[in-house]
């Protein structure tokens, strides 16, 4: 049976535009099955830290050690894969950090950066000077092991030199990589000495080599990519949010959802109502009303502002949200002040999840 | 590991109802939506509404919305869709689905 | 409703060949979702959130796409790849499917 009544009807616009909600771009830990993993908690000032997995709070077990700041996993297996979060709670206040883990046979050292310079990469040489090829720019080609979530941009580089200007080839696996070997193919810029692939899927996984060479010589170099496969999930709610709030009669105030899904979310804001005097209908349940929801016609679902509120407007605020696999709701209180007190900070009052699931 | 194990075939006279059953096992029932799809004889998948079992949440595609009704009992892990006014049209598979398992089936054959 | 439409209606190919299976949808969504079947049985998700392959699915398995066109690619056809192939969208109610994509063995 329903946990509430609704006291209007709410039925859903038929679509929703398609947006994909991330309170950021989790940083990805890699481990091979059986390695342990260890993780330390990135919030500063951790009075205690909490830890979830895929939005399920997380316990010791015998595999999995939390220590302070640190999160160990034992003999990591694929089902350790997922998306983690650490939350710190402090007196007035709590912060979330999100990461990914993920458990693959392929161990690589996360994401590529962005090729900002390029140009000076491509060295011209005095034409008397002949000379083998030779790498220009080192620190480029470091991290040789690069793990991307899936439908990210990959590049690769091997900036060099040499007389005459070498060219340069790619590899796949030791093999010739053809534009047909992958959907979308790759580009190949020979100014910057890149193989660029968009839009990475799991069969791009393996050994990318550069072959440059020239008459004079040849050298290579070989990166790993990895494509960290996502895992479906319920929505997770940045903790915290909804805070709460206090304002005076006549006030503006606006409440906060963050949510991670990647699978699309639906949003709902949600306030407990009286009807005919009584906040519960004769089932025993509570009256809610949704006062927003993600749809067509509604702008950023994420935030709801309350404007010239009264002290009607006063009590419990929910923000629900539902992708096709599961919910998740958080809530947070209003306060309404009399005119002539100024709002304060909130502490008397604490928001505890109200959570329907 | 997960199991998803509906009831049995039905035969079932036009203008009546059906209700086929779904018992969930090896994860937290109330924590995630049961869809039901249908799929009429040599044709493709339909969707026809889900529960969230942990509050009672329901989602129906308007094609059958006010036919069928989706219930479920937490205590026995339980997922029901009943389909009324039943029609020859409404020969089919009718499948239960969390999202990542799929129950075996459940035949309903509508004949008069 | 999002209409989604699977092209070829069928395909037929030879094992150790390339499958190129389609799926456009009506208007945008932001993943798509892709089920194998095979007579007499229950779907099995195939590929989740457009590029991820579903536990124990076969690396020669691959999904891209983006908007409103969506591709299904097996790199070398094996045996028991020939079945039918579902494209999903999870955006907006209802969530509708293709009519199928038919793999036969030529």
């Known amino acids: 049976r329903p946990s509430f009544s609704l006291v209007e009807d709410t039925t859903l616009e038929p679509e929703e535009p398609p947006t994909k909600y991330q309170i950021s771009q989790p940083e990805v830990y890699v481990a091979a099955p059986g390695e342990s993993l260890e993780v330390r908690c990135l919030l500063k000032d951790a009075a205690v830290i909490s830890w979830t997995k895929d939005g399920v709070h997380l316990g010791p077990n015998n595999r999995t050690v939390l220590i302070g700041e640190y999160l160990q996993i034992k003999g990591a297996t694929p089902r350790d894969s997922g998306l983690y979060a650490c939350t710190a709670s402090r007196t007035v206040d709590s912060e979330t950090w999100y990461f990914m883990v993920n458990v693959t046979d392929a161990i690589s050292s996360g994401d590529d950066e962005d090729d900002t310079d390029g140009a000076e990469d491509f060295v011209s040489e005095n034409s008397n000077n002949k000379r083998a090829p030779y790498w220009t720019n080192t620190e480029k080609m470091e991290k040789r092991l690069h793990a991307v979530p899936a439908a990210n941009t990959v590049k690769f580089r091997c900036p060099a030199g040499g007389n005459p200007m070498p060219t340069m080839r790619w590899l796949k696996n030791g093999k010739e990589f053809k534009q047909e070997h992958r959907i979308g193919g790759y580009k190949v810029r020979n100014q910057h000495w890149s193989l660029i692939m968009e839009s990475v899927v799991p069969s791009d996984k393996g050994n990318y080599t550069c072959v440059v060479e020239n008459e004079y010589g040849s050298i290579n170099h070989t990166y790993h990519l990895d494509v960290v496969e996502r895992s479906p999930h319920r929505p997770i709610l940045q903790a915290g949010l909804p805070a709460n709030a206090s304002t005076v009669v006549g006030g503006d105030v606006e409440f906060v959802c963050k949510v991670y899904s990647d699978a699309q979310p639906h949003i709902q804001w949600i306030k407990h109502v009286e009807k005919n005097g009584s906040k519960y209908g004769p089932d025993g349940l509570p009256y809610l009303k949704v006062l927003k929801h993600s749809g067509i016609n509604s702008s950023n679902a994420e935030v709801l502002a309350l404007f010239n509120v009264t002290e009607a407007d006063a009590g419990e605020y929910i923000c629900k949200v539902s992708n096709y696999i599961g919910q998740a709701n958080q809530s947070a209180w209003l306060t309404v002040l009399p005119k002539q007190q100024a709002p304060g900070r909130e502490k008397e009052i604490t928001a505890s999840p109200d959570y329907l699931e | 590991q997960v199991q998803l194990v509906q009831s049995g075939a039905e035969v079932k006279k036009p203008g009546s109802s059906v209700k086929v059953s779904c018992k969930a096992s090896?994860?937290?029932?109330?924590?995630?939506?049961m869809h039901w799809v249908r799929q009429a004889p040599g044709q493709g998948l339909e969707w026809m509404g889900a529960i969230y079992p942990g509050n009672s949440d329901t989602d129906y595609s308007q094609k059958f919305q006010g036919r069928v009704t989706i219930t479920a009992d937490e205590s026995t892990s339980t997922a029901y869709m009943e389909l009324s006014s039943l029609r020859s049209e409404d020969t089919a598979v009718y499948y239960c689905?969390?999202?990542?398992?799929w129950g075996q089936g459940t035949l309903v054959t509508v004949s008069s | 409703e999002i209409v989604l439409t699977q092209s070829p209606a069928t395909l037929s190919l030879s094992p150790g060949e390339r499958a190129t299976l389609s799926c456009r949808a009506s208007?945008?969504?932001?993943?798509m979702y892709w089920y194998q079947q095979k007579p007499g049985q229950a779907p099995r998700p195939w590929i989740y959130l457009t590029s991820n392959r579903a536990t124990g699915i076969p690396a020669r398995f691959s999904g891209s796409g983006s908007g409103t066109d969506y591709t299904l690619t097996i790199s070398s056809l094996e045996p028991e790849d020939f079945a039918v192939y579902y494209c999903?969208?999870?955006?907006?109610?209802?969530?509708?499917f293709g009519q199928g994509t038919k793999l036969e063995i030529k």
């Open positions: 090896g994860y937290t029932f109330s924590s995630y939506w």
């Open positions: 689905s969390k999202f990542d398992y």
């Open positions: 999903q969208q999870w955006s907006s109610n209802p969530y509708t």
């Open positions: 208007s945008s969504v932001n993943y």
